[in-house]
Amino acid sequence: QKSSIEKCSVDIQQSRNKTTERPGLLNCPIYWQQLREKCLLFSHTVNPWNNSLADCSTKESSLLLIRDKDELIHTQNLIRDKAILFWIGLNFSLSEKNWKWINGSFLNSNDLEIRGDAKENSCISISQTSVYSEYCSTEIRWICQKELTPVRNKVYPDS
């Protein structure tokens, strides 16, 4: 049986899949920061994890997904305040007993060194220096992301 947080992330993913595809994003919108092929937006208020997940979706974005250690370090370099924690799009799936990204993939154990327990109602936050398992009900800031679309030369058939 899925927890309410798992249901929430599945619902958002399904509605995202149903929406008609938008033109690719070539530049980061105003207020967003570019980090490689992503645009990041840092919240200025606090929320539990599921509210943060929902709030990113209102910006046509998702909670941050981190591909590897290198991307984690680059993201952490953007965090200016030492003691601040930010939700990212990773939580503990009770049914699969594993950390699961909101896109449905599982955490590669080498990617992030998580401080804290892997258990029910645990979600992942990052700080300037570390990655933490926190109760998903903890109210902290969060990071949204949008993917930038690489520019490809389109070949149009003769009219």
């Epitope: 919240s43 200025h44 910006k59 109210e139």
Partner: antibody, heavy 120, light 107 residues
């Protein structure tokens, strides 16, 4: 009209505590984070902290961590700030101010201010 | 903490003049800067966000510019109702800090 209506001026004795109210109207109270700002000597502005009225989550400027407690009452669309163990240094005008956007730190609506005088 | 310095505590100007009010951050804050106007006996009112974006309803004689550490609020043609204190604020870090204010006086 979007408005934040604060409680009236207060004269309190050193060592006492007091609570300022800020009643929101004209918008969805739970949809915007509330902040509190101190203005002393008619000039100097200091950010005290924030509260998410939807969840009650708070974050404080460390300087005010032991001085201020932020709460909300959703049913009356009212935010509160309690100031503890008051001294003359706490004499100032206190404002509630609405965060304009969840992702930017500017205040788009301010209360009229509550003047606090701490004196024996 | 990031210190926001408004070096001119007072500025004297005449109606119709152009005036530049400056603000300097102690470290790079990008464009995460706000300008507020506080008229006598009133609470602050936002004029400019993100260093240069005019808030809804703000007259176009108010313009913000700058990035990094140096920021300017320009009033292109001062009106008598612009008599006020002007404050800058940074939100590049989550400990929001304000400048000490510049009082604009009309000659």
């Amino acid at each position: 009209e979007v408005q934040l209506q604060q409680s009236g001026p207060e004269l309190v004795k050193p060592g006492a505590s007091m609570k300022i109210s800020c009643k929101a109207s004209g918008y969805s109270f739970t949809g915007y984070t509330m902040n509190w700002v101190k203005q002393s000597h008619g000039k100097n502005l200091e950010w005290i902290g924030l509260i998410n009225p939807n969840t009650g989550g708070t974050y404080y400027n460390q300087k005010f961590k032991d001085k201020a407690t932020l709460t909300v009452d959703k049913s009356s669309s009212t935010a509160y700030m309690e100031l503890l163990s008051l001294t003359s240094e706490d004499s100032a005008v206190y404002y509630c101010a609405r965060l304009g956007d969840n992702y930017r730190g500017y205040f788009d609506v301010w209360g009229q201010g509550t003047t606090l005088t701490v004196s024996s | 903490d990031i210190v926001m310095t408004q070096s001119h505590k007072f500025m004297s100007t005449s109606v119709g003049d152009r005036v530049n009010i400056t603000c300097k951050a102690s470290q790079d804050v990008g464009t995460a800067v706000v300008w507020y106007q506080q008229t006598p006996g009133q609470s602050p009112k936002v004029l400019i966000d993100w260093a240069s974006i005019r808030h809804t309803g703000v007259p176009d004689r108010f313009t913000g510019s700058g990035s990094g550490t140096d920021f300017t609020l320009t009033i292109s043609s001062v009106q008598s109702e612009d008599l006020a204190d002007y404050f800058c604020q940074q939100y590049s870090t989550y400990l929001y800090t304000f400048g000490g204010g510049t009082k604009l006086e009309i000659k």
